[in-house]
């Protein structure tokens, strides 16, 4: 029985070694993935961002809520949300792009302007299904008509023109909470993707009848998560064979 005990210990040790080997392999794979991600982001170390900071940075508009409800769908069966499949099994993916600072935008009139968007390599012009610019309009005290204008920045022309209009719309606002408004920018985005050098940024204006700008472009106190952002839906190549 001493032999059998010894044999049992050897077997156990063998199993443990296999476990350790598997665990180490898994750990090194994870580390390799982390290094890849950091190099893609051009970072040496992982950024130290607290949950609170993330919470403040994330947009608070319906698209984000929907993404979260779709994303968490695996954990729970009570939801319908999922990746969208068409008849050919092409899936669409939603990418939320937050504005970043641009040197060019910082120079206009000597003060920062909003907004400049850098795009992920996933966003290719022939794969863009939908592109919406979401902006948050601050609450109004009295019923008012708001004129929303989205301007595209261009290289200064001879006559000094720096902007060209993309979209303008008129909407009525009632007192109460602010509202999120989306504007279709698919064509502009596709042009930017075809000619990246033409992407110099945009300017957002949302003026009420008194000329007050209601658009949140640089969030003030209590306006975390109200930055403008782009919601882009991209599709992958249809795969007829997948079943």
């Amino acid at each position: 029985n001493e032999n059998s005990e010894q044999k049992e210990n050897v077997e156990k040790e063998g199993l443990c070694n296999a476990c350790t080997w598997r665990q180490n392999t898994k750990s090194s794979r994870i580390e390799a993935i982390k290094i890849q991600i950091l190099s893609k982001l051009r970072l040496e170390t992982a950024p130290n961002i607290s949950k609170d900071v993330i919470r403040q940075l994330l947009p608070k508009a319906p698209p984000l809520r929907e993404l979260i409800d779709q994303y968490d769908v695996q954990r729970d069966d009570s939801s319908d949300g999922s990746l969208e499949d068409d008849d050919y099994h092409a899936t669409t993916e939603t990418i939320i792009t937050m504005p970043t600072e641009s040197d060019f935008l910082m120079q206009v009139d000597g003060k920062p302007k909003c907004c400049f968007f850098k795009f992920s390599s996933k966003i290719q012009y022939n794969k863009v299904v939908k592109a919406q610019l979401w902006i948050y309009l601050r609450p109004v005290e009295t019923p008012t008509t708001v004129f929303v204008q989205i301007l595209r920045l261009i290289k200064p022309m001879k006559d000094g023109t720096r902007y060209t209009g993309i979209r303008s719309l008129k909407l009525d606002m009632n007192p109460g909470t602010g509202i999120w408004q989306s504007i279709d920018v698919k064509t502009v985005l596709q042009n930017w993707l075809k000619q990246p050098e033409s992407n110099l940024g945009i300017e957002i204006k949302a003026l009420d009848e008194n000329g007050h700008d209601l658009a949140v472009t640089f969030p003030g106190p209590g306006e975390d998560g109200l930055n403008p952002f782009l919601e882009v839906k991209v599709t992958d190549t249809p795969k007829r064979s997948r079943r």
């Epitope: 929907e66 769908v73 009570s78």
Partner: antibody, heavy 119, light 110 residues
Framework: QVTLKESGPVLVKPTETLTLTCTVS????????ISWVRQAPGKGLEWVGI???????YYASWAKKRLTISKDTSKNQVVLTMTNMDPVDTATYYC?????????????WGQGTLVTVSS | DIVMTQSPATLSLSPGERATLSCTSS????????LSWFQQKPGQPPKLLIY???TLAYGVPSRFSGSGSGTDFTLTISSLQPEDAATYYC??????????FGQGTKVEIK
Amino acid sequence: QVTLKESGPVLVKPTETLTLTCTVSGIDLSHTDISWVRQAPGKGLEWVGIISYAGKTYYASWAKKRLTISKDTSKNQVVLTMTNMDPVDTATYYCARGVPAYSHGGDLWGQGTLVTVSS
Amino acid sequence: DIVMTQSPATLSLSPGERATLSCTSSQSVYHANWLSWFQQKPGQPPKLLIYWASTLAYGVPSRFSGSGSGTDFTLTISSLQPEDAATYYCAGGYGGGRYAFGQGTKVEIK
């Protein structure tokens, strides 16, 4: 004026299908999530489901097999359809702008419509 | 299933007193702050008071405040007014299309 108004039958027989309509004005349904919440007489609020700005639906687990929420943006209407109604489904049904619990969702509600399930 | 428990079931206080209402969730709300508070008076739809756990909704008096994170939340009415007599509900969001309401706390004014 921004408003939501629920409409539909006041009385439904057991096993029948309930269809309620939420008609909105001053709200663009292509930018706004709409939620349904119900309240049995003398009881608390109960979440029923959502139709998102993009048309996706999310349902409470108890309602998943019986519930369909759809919308017609051009008519400014959101429709709730609940099959196989039971007396325990007797409640005031509310539609609300946004999603209660997310951001400032639930800042605007309809007046509610009382649906009684009885033979 | 997610359970949101509110306590006490009934709170009876005099005008000017401080009211503290509690809401506990069986699991953490999404991002620790997907929580709102609503006030409902008989025969009326609910009214939004607080969102993001602590942000005061537009037009709500400053005597109302919200606090808490994760699973435990508090609604405080610093100085009760007669018009605050109502039932108060918390509502939580959990991701994955899951939302829930607490069973409510009835506030009575003596």
